[in-house]
Interface confidence: low
């Protein structure tokens, strides 16, 4: 069951899934001047069995001008830089740390993909929040949100996080700890 809405927005924070539940879809979006190849799937789908999950389909973008040329999936460094989410991805480095049954890892970038990834999450998905650079996390509880089904409707739980204007960003689960929080709890205590 797909979640009807996006995860909640937290001021000065971004969210990230550590792993994606089977059934999650990722739109194959291309940046300006490029389009999805005509034979290509419009989305990638996390599928699998009890032992292994992976993304079905590959996103491929081709130049709108050169219709015959199919771009390779392997991203070039300059194209990776253009992705707004690249900073977050490079901070995370979570894909290699995660192997949850029934979940897919973060798909690698494809050449000329759009600047923001659009995921369609399914019920049971957890996303984790991190304050953006220059803001520090104040935790009242878990800095995470879970898509739940209640009375036949999907809803996201409210993450207990406030981002205040200081220098150190908070961390997603599994990241190295740069420093302790003022209350003595490590910043990475967001998924417990």
């Amino acid at each position: 069951e797909l979640c009807d809405d996006d995860p909640p927005k937290i001021t000065h924070a971004t969210f990230k899934a550590v792993a994606y539940k089977e059934g999650t879809m990722l739109n194959c979006e291309c940046k300006r001047g490029f389009r999805r190849i005509k034979s290509g799937s419009p989305y990638m789908l996390c599928t699998g069995n009890s032992s292994h999950s992976s993304w079905d389909n590959q996103c491929q973008c081709t130049s709108s001008a050169a219709r015959n040329t199919t771009k390779q999936v392997t991203p070039q460094p300059e194209e990776q830089k253009e992705r707004k989410t690249t900073e977050m991805q490079s901070q995370m480095q979570l894909a290699d740390q995660v192997s949850l049954p029934g979940h897919c890892r973060e798909p690698p970038p494809w050449e000329n993909e759009a600047t923001e990834r659009i995921y369609h999450f399914v019920v049971g998905q957890t996303v984790y929040y991190q304050c953006v650079q220059g803001y520090r996390a104040l935790h009242r509880g878990p800095a995470e949100s879970v898509c739940k089904m209640t009375h036949g409707k999907t809803r996201w739980t409210q993450p207990q996080l406030i981002c205040t204007g200081e220098t150190e960003p908070s961390q997603f689960p599994g990241e190295e700890e740069p420093q302790a929080s003022p209350d003595g709890l490590p910043e990475s205590e967001t998924s417990r």
Partner: nanobody, 127 residues
């Protein structure tokens, strides 16, 4: 479930302008590509314009290029179709449509690609 409600249709003289609005509710508006289609009397439903989730891609039917402008306001969950220099052949019922399929920059979508539709608003252009 996504609900779409169009408004702004009416009777206008040739050369005039109208602005159609489409209010979306009940779903993840930000992730959906939005389109306008129209059906003239006795004709098939035809593509008019579409806009991608990030407003990066906008597509238009050849017949409306340079006259119609599609836009969206994700904050208000609205999609608009500004129609200028209207012609009698623009007379039709105009439908707002939404779907989760990414919009490719030079492949005009077909009606079958869209999962969600409004009830339509009548536009009549008199000569």
């Amino acid at each position: 479930q996504v609900q779409l409600v169009e408004s702004g249709g009416g009777l206008v003289q040739a050369g005039g302008s109208l602005r159609l609005s489409c209010a979306a509710s009940g779903g993840t508006f930000r992730t959906r590509n939005m389109g306008w289609f129209r059906r003239a009397p006795g004709k098939e439903r035809e593509f008019v314009a579409a806009v991608s989730w990030n407003v990066d891609n906008k597509l238009y039917a050849d017949s409306v290029k340079g006259r119609f402008t599609i836009s969206r306001d994700n904050g208000r969950n609205m999609v608009y179709l500004q129609m200028n220099s209207l012609k009698p052949e623009d007379t039709a019922v105009y439908y707002c449509a939404a779907d989760n399929i990414p919009l490719s920059s030079d492949m005009r979508p077909t009606a079958t690609e869209y999962d969600y539709w409004g009830q339509g608003t009548q536009v009549t252009v008199s000569s």
